[in-house]
């Protein structure tokens, strides 16, 4: 006996209950493929997510996280609060980071600043909670009658700090 | 049929005190830690405050000291008991499930209730 399911259609299911029919998918769920015996529940976005595709007959619901959040995990399967930069997320919530890290984005950990003087270079500009440091010539390229190549960088202007 | 239910909220004086409840039906809540979040107009959503199924407690630094979360096993119930209140601490207040265990992170299948007001006005 043939089965009848195959030629069911995405966005149908095949219904054993009337004779392998193919019926349509009942409101709130979904097949993506063909042959179905069952319609799959859509996925809803509630709380901290957001719909950023609505579910069809044929395909599931697309969740985003609301603002002050960012999707972790495929399909954005957990919504993540943001942070400032220069601070990262811990079991109290947002906290700054320590001397001596940093974090540029509004997620992740703090992370520590570059040691310049593993690459034997010295500090041009210190580091801040924001940023990590930014590492300039090696200390003997700076010296008196040291020749360089390449001029070093000018100088940056008091009471200007990197954005 | 999960369900979450929210209710206690309301208008109350600057350094006044509240107590919300939150019902919670359909799943095994003895097993299950719990959040409270919020929502100030024009903000964005906070989280609150958390209480994993032992009772360990989580709060955010701005309620810590004002804020107590707990639970009742025996009555499927979480409350936010809310003292010293702020007008800053006006806003739709949240009860859900907490299934990812990590502060300010939320998973798909949690569930969520619907909210209930919570105003701090002289």
């Known amino acids: 006996l043939q089965d009848l399911c195959s030629n069911c259609p995405a966005g149908t299911f095949c219904d054993n209950n009337r004779s392998q029919i193919c019926s349509p998918c009942p409101p709130n769920s979904f097949s993506s493929a063909g042959g179905q015996r069952t319609c799959d529940i859509c996925r809803q976005c509630k709380g901290v997510f957001k719909t950023r595709k609505e579910c069809s007959s044929t395909s599931n619901a697309e969740c985003d996280c609301i603002s002050g959040y960012h999707c972790l995990g495929a399909e954005c399967s957990m919504c993540e609060q943001d942070c400032k930069q220069g601070q990262e997320l811990t079991k109290k919530g947002c906290k700054d980071c320590c001397f001596g890290t940093f974090n540029d984005q509004k997620r992740g950990i703090c992370r520590p600043w570059t040691n310049c003087s593993l690459d034997g270079k010295s500090v041009l500009v210190n580091g801040t909670k924001e940023r990590d440091v930014v590492c300039g010539p090696s200390p003997a390229d700076l010296s008196p009658g040291a020749s360089s190549a390449t001029p070093p960088a000018p100088a940056r202007e008091p009471g200007h700090s990197p954005q | 049929e999960v369900d979450l239910v929210e209710s206690g909220g309301g208008l109350v004086q600057p350094g006044g005190s509240l107590r919300l409840s939150c019902a919670v039906s359909g799943f095994t809540f003895s097993n299950s830690a719990m959040s409270w979040a919020r929502q100030a107009p024009g903000k964005e959503f906070e989280w609150v405050s958390s209480i994993y199924s032992d009772g360990k407690t989580y709060y955010v630094d701005s309620v810590k000291g004002r804020f107590t979360i707990s639970r009742d096993n025996a009555k499927n119930t979480v409350y936010l008991q809310m003292s010293s209140l702020k007008p800053e601490d006006t806003a739709v207040y949240y009860c859900?499930?907490?299934?990812?265990?990590?502060?300010?992170?939320?998973?798909?299948?949690?569930?969520w209730g619907q909210g209930t007001q919570v105003t701090v006005s002289s």
């Open positions: 859900a499930t907490w299934k990812t265990l990590r502060v300010g992170v939320w998973d798909e299948s949690d569930y």
